[in-house]
Structure formats: structure tokens, C-alpha cells
Interface confidence: low
């Protein structure tokens, strides 16, 4: 399964969304959950509801949101206000019993301005990757996170 | 792909000023900051400042504190390069280059000058 | 600011032969340094980023290393592309200083 790199500024919200044949996943819960290392287990972040009738009902851990279009076969997922450790690898998954079948691998980038004092040095610019069918990314528009700016010499 | 287009050459008299402009696609415009980078004739690479197309946030070279100025729109995802009160030594291709922006993701993060705009030059003659 | 200082000024080498390329930085960058190749009439080309990553579709001949103030970069085999102009830049404090190019050129 190909990994799709979804970028979102500090501060910010981050939309993912992660397509699914809508019959094929009849039933089943979703889930998004933190992958430990490459080859390490996925630790779950949020489920949807328990109920899969509700499961298009926003469920809430913390900053991260899930909510289950179970008749268009879209679960999206949001991570409000970004920050620098919710950057690395994720799983959409969809629950059977105690199996999860990974529906879309997604590496979360986390973007701010260059530097802060404390972190003298330490900048980066993505390599774009195409964004391809089964997951999309929406940046939020608000523009109030203020960055401070990089020592100078 | 990721494309910095930069508006065409310019003439201008000593004592002017001059907009350079710099149209970004392929990428989320306010996710990044654009680097202006100008190179005279026969001569090295000079980095003149930084503007985070994000939030305005600017940071200038010294020698051109006072006549340069750098402004994004974000609504045509375009940057601009202002420069004032010209002299022959402004003679120069002027560049814009994306970046640079912190990036967190697993392990690591890193910077890059990458793409780059195809250049304007910038005559300043009497 | 940071002072970066390339040499030599001039390489001429033959197409086939190693090129190692210097920059030294008049204080430490920690591995924040980057290269670019430019040729005549072309924006610059980024290579190298961390001083070490090769960029997107950078061919493995070239590599560089070094952290602190002393960086090279190395290719290994030149190929008729590859002469051209080669600069390296700090990314560790404003202002984000270049050094002053290595020219690459046939001998």
C-alpha cells in the first residue's frame, strides 16, 4: 500500500480523508491510529462510533476528530491545531472483530516558518508528492499562528 | 509540478525602483516562504531576504535593509520583490526560490533553496 | 554573518575523473548546508540538502559530507553535464550566505 504525505502548517487544522468501497466495508467501524516505527504496531488515536449507524456522529481523542460517510465510503479524519509531535506515520483502518484491514497509509508533515531561538538551524522543505485517490488533505485558511522569527548571525 | 514563473526583464534608470513578481503552482502557496536570490553579472549568488508567504513575516540582508521590500499575494499566489532607488551595482538576474520552512515528520527535518524561478534580470542604466 | 568560503576557485578536470569540491564555514552550521549546481544562463539546481541528502533525481555520483565548518562534494565520476559552477549555502542564521562558487571545467 503506496503512503500518502499530507502537509499541514502549525497551528493549523489537517483534513484527511481515506476512501473505501463503500459494500466491501458494510458494517464496519473505522479507525486512525499512529504507526511505532516503520515495521512497529499502530497505536489506535480514535474509532469511530460504536454504533455503525452513528458512526457519521463526530467522535473525538483530544485534538483528532473521526466521522464515517458509511454510504459514500469516506472517513475523515481532522487533527486540529498541528504541532510538531503530531508529525509521522498513520493508518485509516477498518475494523472486523479484532482484525484492522489498513484502508491508507498517511505520512503527516508539519510545516512552520524558519526557526525559532530554540531550534537554531533547524529548517526544511518538503518534497511535493503527489496527492493520488484515496486520501486528500483541505488546509484550514485561518492565518493568526504567529511564528517567531530565525536568530541572526 | 511545483513552478515559480517570474515576470520579464526590465530596464530601468538610476534612482528607480523595480517589482520583480514571482507566480507559484503546484503547491500550497501559504505553506512556504519564498527566498529572493540575485546574481550580477559574472558574479556569485547573493541572498537578499526571505518572506513567509504564511503570515508576512519578512527577513532582509542587511546591505539592502531600507530599499527592498518583499510582499506576497496570496489570492494569485504570487511574491513580489521591490527595490528602490537603484544604482548600476543592482545590476543583476534576481531570483525567487521556495523556501525555506520547518517541517516536522518522523525522525528528522531539513532545508532546501528548491524550486527555483527562471530569473529576471534587471538592468539599472542611465 | 557566516562566511563560506569554496575552494578551489577553479577545478579542471577531465570527463571520468573525481572532483572534490570544499567549503568552509567561518562558523559551525552543524550539517544546515547546501549545494547547487549552476550553469550559464540557468537558475541554480539544488543537489545536495543537510549537507549529505541527495535531492530528488540527483544521479548517485554525486554525494557530499561533512558537519560543523568543513563540507565536500564529491563526484565521483564527471560526467560532460556536470561542468559547471557548484555553490554551497548555510541554512542556519539569517542571512542564508552562499559561498563564493567552485568552477568546474573541462580540462
Known amino acids: 500500500l503506496n503512503t500518502t504525505v499530507l502537509q499541514g502548517m502549525a497551528g493549523q487544522s489537517l483534513r484527511v480523508s481515506c476512501t473505501y468501497d463503500a459494500l466491501k466495508h458494510w458494517g464496519r467501524r473505522k479507525a486512525w491510529c499512529r504507526q511505532l516505527g516503520e515495521e512497529g504496531p499502530c497505536q489506535r488515536v480514535v474509532s469511530t462510533h460504536g454504533v455503525w449507524l452513528l458512526a457519521f456522529l463526530k467522535k473525538r481523542n483530544g485534538s483528532t476528530v473521526i466521522a464515517d460517510d458509511t454510504l459514500a465510503g469516506t472517513v475523515t479524519i481532522t487533527l486540529k491545531n498541528l504541532q510538531a509531535g503530531d508529525a509521522g506515520l498513520y493508518q485509516c483502518q477498518s475494523l472486523r472483530g479484532r482484525e484492522a484491514e489498513v484502508l491508507q497509509k498517511v505520512l503527516v508533515e508539519v510545516l512552520e516558518d524558519p526557526l525559532d531561538d530554540q531550534d537554531a538551524g533547524d529548517l526544511w522543505v518538503p518534497e511535493e508528492s503527489s496527492s493520488f485517490e484515496g486520501a486528500q488533505v483541505e488546509h484550514s485558511t485561518s492565518r493568526n499562528q504567529e511564528t517567531s522569527f530565525p536568530p541572526t548571525s | 509540478q511545483v513552478q515559480l514563473v517570474q515576470s520579464g526583464a526590465e530596464v530601468k534608470k538610476p534612482g528607480a525602483s523595480v517589482k520583480v513578481s514571482c507566480k507559484a503552482s503546484?503547491?500550497?502557496?501559504?505553506?512556504?516562504?519564498i527566498s529572493w536570490v540575485r546574481q550580477a553579472p559574472g558574479q556569485g549568488l547573493e541572498w537578499m531576504g526571505w518572506?513567509?508567504?504564511?503570515?508576512?513575516?519578512?527577513n532582509y540582508a542587511q546591505k539592502l535593509q531600507g530599499r527592498v521590500t518583499m510582499t506576497t499575494d496570496t489570492s494569485t499566489s504570487t511574491a513580489y520583490m521591490e527595490l528602490r532607488s537603484l544604482r548600476s551595482d543592482d545590476t543583476a538576474v534576481y531570483y525567487c526560490?521556495?523556501?525555506?520552512?520547518?517541517?516536522?515528520?518522523?525522525?528528522?527535518?531539513?532545508?532546501?533553496?528548491?524550486?527555483w524561478g527562471q530569473g529576471t534580470l534587471v538592468t539599472v542604466s542611465s | 554573518e557566516i562566511v563560506l568560503t569554496q575552494s578551489p576557485a577553479t577545478l579542471s578536470l577531465s570527463p571520468g575523473e573525481r572532483a572534490t569540491l570544499s567549503c568552509r564555514a567561518s562558523?559551525?552550521?552543524?550539517?544546515?548546508l547546501a549545494w547547487y549546481q549552476q550553469k550559464p544562463g540557468q537558475a541554480p539546481r539544488l543537489l545536495i540538502y543537510?549537507?549529505?541528502k541527495r535531492a530528488t533525481g540527483i544521479p548517485a555520483r554525486f554525494s557530499g559530507s561533512g558537519s560543523g565548518t568543513d563540507f565536500t562534494l564529491t563526484i565521483s565520476s564527471l560526467e560532460p553535464e556536470d561542468f559547471a559552477v557548484y555553490y554551497c549555502?548555510?541554512?542556519?542564521?539569517?542571512?542564508?550566505?552562499f559561498g563564493g562558487g567552485t568552477k568546474v571545467e573541462i580540462k
Open positions: 526560490a521556495r523556501g525555506p520552512t520547518k517541517a516536522y515528520y518522523g525522525s528528522g527535518s531539513y532545508v532546501v533553496f528548491d524550486p
Open positions: 503546484g503547491y500550497t502557496f501559504t505553506n512556504y516562504g
Open positions: 518572506i513567509s508567504a504564511y503570515n508576512g513575516n519578512t
Open positions: 562558523q559551525s552550521v552543524s550539517s544546515y
Open positions: 543537510d549537507a549529505s
Open positions: 549555502q548555510q541554512v542556519s542564521l539569517f542571512p542564508l550566505t
